[in-house]
Interface confidence: low
């Protein structure tokens, strides 16, 4: 009779994450007796997969039933495969031998390559906030893939960029992959509502890529413009001075009037008015009774905008003549006004 | 030597808790399925968790759900926590060690008695 | 869950005796079967896995055959430390269950 061979088919075999893999092994004789054992990789180092004779291999199930006297059939199915699984598989014949089966005959082996999906890729941005004109990087990773080739691309608000630097490791093989970019974003004050979007195209996927976007709102912040404006009024001896705070992101402010140098009143801004790039303005006013100064008052708006060094716009507010000689004796008085334009004051 | 040392055993109210330990020598532990087996007094064995390898866990029925199988790697050691604690669970505790490829038990601990009384 | 089931609970021998000790699966378990001994007061020992094969140290005089669902462990010449209760087990499936033990006594 002609000497046992055997035959692995296959030489590669190639199997998504979380499939089952099907290794393909026949005997071409069923003498010597002995069991058949599944190895991944070859040497001394070699990983047992299945042992025919013994075992409890929860993940491997026999194509045919072993047990059978006549089966040559000793392919085997690996569940649930994942990257790690990768490597070349052989299927070796052992005589039965003491007090250790000795190996008698090896298939040729077949290569196993998992193909494993990239995972969602997470986009995060800088740690603060930066204002416009300025540069930010936003930096984009996604995990676990197989094989290596993967495609990265960045876009903000639909347009591609060009200033990022991407990195795949390891380099050298390893079962599987992960990619790291960086992107570099020049901030504009119509951000706000702008988007930074990381595409990523692996043969996984079949020509749907994953997205991963952040947000331009949690890394801009838009500092207010202000303008100190004093309000037509009927009465004579009252002054209304606004404060006009403009295109200001994020919300968070606190505003302060300052007559002569002094603390007249602080508001935190509450009732904003947003615009249509997403930045917020907010209007405060003061009323000043002109008939409780003597001389000529510097009224002074000072804004305090995410926790950022204060910012001020002064208005100096003229007291006339006539308002001098009345009032000497008249007491101050700084109001809200009852109604609110713009939203008003908080 | 390759040896199974188990600990923390003792006496507890019904409803406590109690966290046993196995310490291995002589092997490295995460090589191997591991598994706790248990035996009243006077009764038989009976198989009451594994985790294998790859931290995968198993349990039998009645501590599903209250006992929590672990190990520490760097301290070479396996664990058993168990929770809201029964009068049926009081027994001794053995640790046990799978076979390299068949889990086939082949190491057994000396046992720690747990007793779960008011 | 696997049930299994050993015969006789308990057996009377003399020294020098040959004794066969019986276990059924409630279903196909392959040769997925251990048996143990186990004195009183002291841990389980692993005498056979996958339904013949012996543990490392154990004497030759213990032997198992079987597979599927019917199971035999043999002792060919009883000796005085041989008299304790067996236990097989199944390892196919979780849960991992046993017989209900088998006491070896001195007739």
């Known amino acids: 009779e002609d000497e046992l061979q055997v035959i692995q088919p296959e030489k590669s075999v190639s199997v998504a994450a979380g499939e089952s893999a099907t290794l393909r092994c026949a005997m071409t004789s069923l003498i010597p007796v002995g069991p058949i054992m599944w190895f991944r990789g070859a040497g001394a180092g070699r990983e047992l997969i299945y042992n025919q004779k013994e075992g409890h291999f929860p993940r491997v199930t026999t194509v045919s039933e072993l047990t059978k006297r006549n089966n040559l059939d000793f392919s085997i199915s690996i569940s649930n495969i994942t990257p790690a699984d990768a490597g070349t598989y052989y299927c070796v014949k052992f005589r039965k031998g003491s007090p250790d089966d000795v190996e008698f005959k090896s298939g040729a082996g077949t290569e196993l390559s998992v193909r494993a999906k990239p995972s969602a890729p997470v986009v995060s941005g800088p740690a603060v906030r930066a204002t416009p004109e300025h540069t930010v990087s936003f930096t984009c990773e996604s995990h676990g893939f197989s094989p290596r080739d993967i495609t990265l691309k960045w876009f903000k608000n639909g347009n591609e960029l060009s200033d990022f630097q991407t990195n795949v490791d390891p380099a050298g093989d390893s079962v599987s992959y992960s990619i790291h970019s960086t992107a570099r974003v020049v901030l504009t004050r119509g951000d706000v509502h702008s988007q930074v979007i990381c595409e990523i195209a692996h043969i996984t996927l079949q020509g749907d890529p994953l997205r991963g976007t952040a947000n331009l709102s949690e890394a801009i912040r838009v500092p207010p413009t202000l303008e100190v404006t004093q309000q037509p009024m009927r009465a004579e001896n009252q002054a209304n001075v606004t404060c006009q705070v403009s295109n200001f992101y994020p919300r968070g402010l606190q505003l302060t009037w300052l007559e002569n140098g002094n603390v007249s009143r602080t508001e935190t801004a509450s009732t904003l008015i947003e615009n249509k790039d997403g930045t917020y303005n907010w209007m405060s006013w003061l009323l000043v009774n002109t008939c409780a100064h003597r001389d000529d008052v510097v009224l002074t708006c000072q804004v305090e905008h995410d926790g950022q060094q204060a910012v001020s716009k002064s208005y100096a507010l003229e007291i006339s003549a006539h308002q001098k000689e009345h009032g000497s004796d008249i007491t101050h008085e700084a109001a809200l006004a009852p109604t609110a334009p713009l939203g008003g004051s908080g | 030597e390759v040896q199974l040392v188990e600990s923390g055993g003792g006496l507890v109210q019904p409803g406590g808790s109690l966290r046993l330990s196995c310490a291995a020598s002589?092997?490295?532990?995460?090589?191997?399925?591991m598994h706790w087996v248990r035996q009243a007094t006077g009764k038989g064995l009976e198989w009451v968790s594994a985790i294998g390898t790859a931290g995968d866990t198993y349990y039998t029925g009645s501590v599903k759900g209250r006992f929590t199988i672990s190990r520490e790697n760097a301290k070479n050691s396996l664990y058993l926590q168990m929770n809201s604690l029964r009068a049926g669970d009081t027994a001794v505790y053995y640790c046990v060690r799978g076979g390299v490829w068949d889990d086939a038990f082949d190491i057994w601990g000396q046992g720690t008695m747990v007793t779960v009384s008011s | 869950d696997i049930q299994m089931t050993q015969s006789p609970s308990s057996l009377s021998a003399s020294v020098g005796d040959r004794v066969t000790i019986t276990c059924r699966a409630s279903q196909d378990i392959n040769n997925y079967l251990a048996w143990f001994q186990q004195k009183p007061g002291k841990a389980p020992k692993s005498l056979i896995y996958?339904?013949?094969s012996l543990h490392s140290g154990v004497p030759s005089k213990f032997s198992g055959s079987g597979s599927g669902t019917d199971f035999t462990l043999t002792i060919s010449s009883l000796q005085p430390e041989d008299f304790a209760t067996y236990y097989c087990q199944q390892y196919v499936s979780y849960p991992y269950t046993f017989g209900q033990g088998t006491k070896l006594e001195i007739k």
């Open positions: 002589g092997f490295t532990l995460s090589s191997y399925d």
């Open positions: 996958t339904a013949s």
